[in-house]
Amino acid sequence: NKILVKQSPMLVAYDNAVNLSCKYSYNLFSREFRASLHKGLDSAVEVCVVYGNYSQQLQVYSKTGFNCDGKLGNESVTFYLQNLYVNQTDIYFCKIEVMYPPPYLDNEKSNGTIIHVKGKHLCPSPLFPGPSKP
């Protein structure tokens, strides 16, 4: 039995930040679970991890230098990524693992979300005339 995951096909990070919601065909509230977000077609970079246990507070961390936070819904985990760089535009995959109670469960690989990071466009300041000379 595999958990199904739904993600938006594409998100644009205009302000170098984005909310990526991973929706599962599974209620996580009474489970010990590990939800993670992976970057790249080969999912080589683990961007962020949300670890949950119904009797404890959520643990959210990144071991790869990403600025991330996470929120839990009963059938979803939302990853909030900040300070993204343009060169981090890539495809991102949600992964879910149910650790306890047994048996261990994980997900069918999802289609992923392309996160397109737009660089900050600094608008030129309006030109104010200098003080007029008499």
Partner: antibody
Framework: VQLQQSGAELKKPGASVKVSCKAS????????IHWIKLRSGQGLEWIGW????????QYNAQFKGKATLTADKSSSTVYMELTGLTPEDSAVYFC??????????????WGQGTLVTVSA | DIQMTQSPSSLSASVGDRVTITCKTN??????LAWYQQKDGKSPQLLIY???HLVEGVPSRFSGSGSGTQYSLTISSLQPEDFGNYYC?????????FGGGTKLEIK
């Protein structure tokens, strides 16, 4: 799915009894088996569960030292041994399979029950 | 441990009546609750899981509702075969306690 329990037992106080629950119709190592006690005129009491896939066990604190759960994978059987029997242990004992309904648990399959009577 | 308070402990009703049994918990169990029917000498039968989901094959006169710490089982139109004992059970961690039970008798 079938859970076939062993037959009724009559035991003396202080003795032990081992109740069996033989599973069939599914992959034995993929499901948790719960044990439940039903005393005459009283309600259902949860004893604990056993997971044959990894031998994980959870007990109700009230039954620690009283009940011991084990399994034999070769015969797809889970056992519950009760020790130091007293008249309060006289009850019908059920095994039941836990199913995971997309993250919500329930017990849809039950054994027929085993009556244990403790009497001098 | 989670305490389950089931009420009433017994009830007598007539065929065709609408009957409601309630189960209260001392903390939020997030709908991780099941309801069972048990008749004398028989094994319990699962009626409802996840607080509101009817098990396949169970008559639609049975329904479950509630969330948080308050849950109920309703039989919309009581039938003669509905007599017996009813139990709620939570699955929010262990011990997976049962409610004290409700003995339903047909008038």
């Amino acid at each position: 799915v079938q859970l076939q329990q062993s037959g009724a037992e009559l035991k003396k106080p202080g003795a032990s009894v081992k109740v069996s629950c033989k599973a069939s119709g599914y992959t034995f190592t993929e499901y948790i088996i719960h044990w439940i006690k039903l005393r005459s005129g009283q309600g259902l009491e949860w004893i604990g569960w056993f997971y044959p896939g990894s031998n994980d066990i959870q007990y109700n604190a009230q039954f620690k030292g009283k009940a011991t759960l084990t399994a034999d994978k070769s015969s797809s059987t889970v056992y519950m041994e009760l020790t130091g029997l007293t008249p309060e242990d006289s009850a019908v004992y059920f095994c039941a399979r836990r199913d995971d309904f997309s993250g919500y648990d329930a017990l849809p399959y039950w054994g027929q029950g085993t009556l244990v009577t403790v009497s001098a | 441990d989670i305490q389950m308070t089931q009420s009433p402990s017994s009830l007598s009703a007539s065929v065709g009546d609408r009957v409601t049994i309630t189960c209260k918990t001392n903390e939020n169990i997030y709908s991780n609750l099941a309801w069972y029917q048990q008749k004398d000498g028989k094994s319990p039968q699962l009626l409802i899981y996840a607080a509101t989901h009817l098990v396949e094959g169970v008559p639609s006169r049975f329904s479950g509702s509630g969330s948080g710490t308050q849950y109920s089982l309703t039989i919309s139109s009581l039938q003669p075969e509905d007599f017996g004992n009813y139990y709620c059970q939570h699955f929010w961690g262990t011990p997976a306690t049962f409610g004290g039970g409700t003995k339903l008798e047909i008038k």
